[in-house]
């Protein structure tokens, strides 16, 4: 008789979960000197242990803690690079501007990047069926505790200027209900961070609108003078050209405003 | 001129109602973050609610959550508090004040007195 | 009880030199925006000081300083319309509130 199963409004853990952590740790392991220390079956054995045999609505910080602890890792605290709702293009910055870090270029962040995970209560399974979606079932289960863990942690760690990347597409371009608004924005240390400066993304060609103007981007700026963090916002209205830029700054066209 | 103008209080019996209102001018109100601050006859300030420009973040001092809900009209440049099951320690004179950024609440109505007591 | 402790009263003579303390914690203070306003007698707050900053009219006897978890407010040259409340506030992260002080009562003397 096939044992009851709870179904959950969410996508089920991503299949070959527990060998993509595992290749994804040996391959992270191999291209940063600086983390080769790391055993990965140990970093596996952490991150199963968070949520293997417990419920995946009540998941703690706690439970993450042993990964954390074996996952710990410096990056330079003033290249810190979040992102709100454009993870492409952060992702595809990152990777031309080498100095600079997102959450995904640390090893915690580029194991679990887009992968979903859950298990089920009182069993070692690992439940490919269905996870809890955040909205529909619950806000502590697995994969939103270890995102809102690791982030916390890497807004913690950030120092001096500190940028982020918003989506001015949106119609919230600064979302108090994104991990940025509900997480890292509240975690950034005053005594540390002197400025965050944000660059608003625009999506139309033509749209030469100052989106740093727009209420929401007031609203961040609001809270985060309270805080007594210097504030600034640039429009990138042309993303490409950006992106371009970056790769070859002394191109003639890149002295114009992007 | 920049101003508040607060107005809606008076003397309500324990357990009732009532709804203040604070309308902006002499700047663009949609920029700022919008506050509530009592005193009490004789005590100091205390702060009771605030609203954040686009009304997404909205807090409340203890001592009136789950009564007063603090909400804004930006297109009439009004801020309004819903108090209910007011109480003998909610009268005060109920300010307005706004929130500039880096500075603090530099625009302070002149007060509304709100008076519970049967 | 306030989040943050002022002396309940000062005073001064003309001309003199007076100093208001405020006493919080790395939660508000240490960290945050720390303001001063001054009530004069039967009117609204005034914002006196942001940051240890004037906002423009504020006479420069008034000036404002922070050490880790104390802020405070010195006027020199106290004149008679010094007389009123002067209350500090800062954001608290902890609470996610403002926080005033109980507010001191400068009398000059």
């Known amino acids: 008789v096939p044992r009851w199963r709870q179904q959950w409004s969410g996508p089920g853990t991503t299949k070959r979960f527990p060998e993509t952590v595992l290749a994804r740790c040996v391959k992270y392991t191999e291209i940063h000197p600086e983390m080769r220390h790391v055993d990965c079956q140990s970093v596996w054995d952490a991150f199963k242990g968070a949520f293997i045999s417990k419920h995946p609505c009540n998941i703690t910080e706690e439970d993450y803690q042993p990964l954390m602890k074996l996952g710990t890792q410096t990056v330079p605290c003033n290249k810190i690079l979040l992102w709100s709702r454009i993870k492409d293009l952060a992702h595809q910055f990152t990777q031309v501007q080498r100095d600079m870090f997102t959450l995904e270029d640390t090893l915690l962040g580029y194991l679990a990047d887009d992968l979903t995970w859950c298990g089920e209560f009182n069993t070692s399974k690992i439940n490919y069926q269905s996870c809890p979606d955040w909205r529909k079932d619950c806000s502590n289960n697995p994969v939103s505790v270890f995102w809102k863990t690791v982030s916390r942690r890497f807004a913690e760690a950030a120092c001096d200027v500190v940028h982020v990347m918003l989506n001015g597409s949106r119609s919230k371009i600064f979302d108090k209900n994104s991990t940025f608004g509900s997480v890292e924005v509240h975690n950034l240390q005053p005594e540390k961070v002197q400025t965050l400066e944000a660059w608003v993304i625009h999506g139309g060609r033509e749209d030469s609108r100052d989106l740093c103007q727009d209420p929401t981007i007031k609203e961040l700026e609001s809270i985060i003078s309270k805080r007594n963090i210097q504030f600034s916002c640039k429009n990138i209205y042309r993303p490409d050209k950006f992106l371009q830029c970056v790769k070859n700054p002394e191109d003639s066209s890149c002295t114009s405003e992007i | 001129e920049v101003q508040l103008l607060e107005s809606g209080g008076g003397l309500v019996q324990p357990g009732g109602s009532l709804r203040l209102s604070c309308v902006a001018s002499g700047f663009t109100f949609t920029n700022y973050e919008m506050n509530w601050v009592r005193q009490a006859p004789g005590k100091g300030l205390e702060w009771v609610s605030s609203i954040s420009i686009t009304g997404n973040y909205i807090y409340y001092a203890d001592s009136v959550k789950g009564r007063f809900t603090i909400s804004r009209d930006n297109s009439k440049n009004t801020l309004y508090l819903q108090m209910n099951d007011l109480r003998a320690e909610d009268t005060a004179v109920y300010y307005c004040?706004?929130?500039?950024?880096?500075?603090?609440?530099?625009?302070w109505g002149q007060g509304t007195t709100v008076t519970v007591s049967s | 009880q306030s989040v943050l402790t002022q002396p309940p009263s000062a005073s001064g003579t003309p001309g003199q030199r007076v100093t208001i303390s405020c006493s919080g914690s790395s939660s508000n203070i240490k960290n945050n925006l720390v303001n001063w306003y001054q009530q004069l007698p039967g009117t609204a707050p005034k914002l006196l000081i942001y940051n240890n900053q004037r906002p423009s009219g504020v006479p420069d006897r008034f000036s404002g300083s922070k050490s880790g978890t104390s802020a405070s407010l010195a006027i020199s040259g106290l004149q008679s319309e010094d007389e009123a409340d002067y209350y500090c506030?800062?954001?608290?992260?902890?609470?996610?509130?403002?926080?005033f002080g109980g507010g001191t009562k400068l009398t000059v003397l």
């Open positions: 004040a706004n929130y500039k950024s880096y500075h603090g609440m530099d625009v």
């Open positions: 506030a800062a954001w608290d992260d902890s609470l996610n509130a403002w926080v």
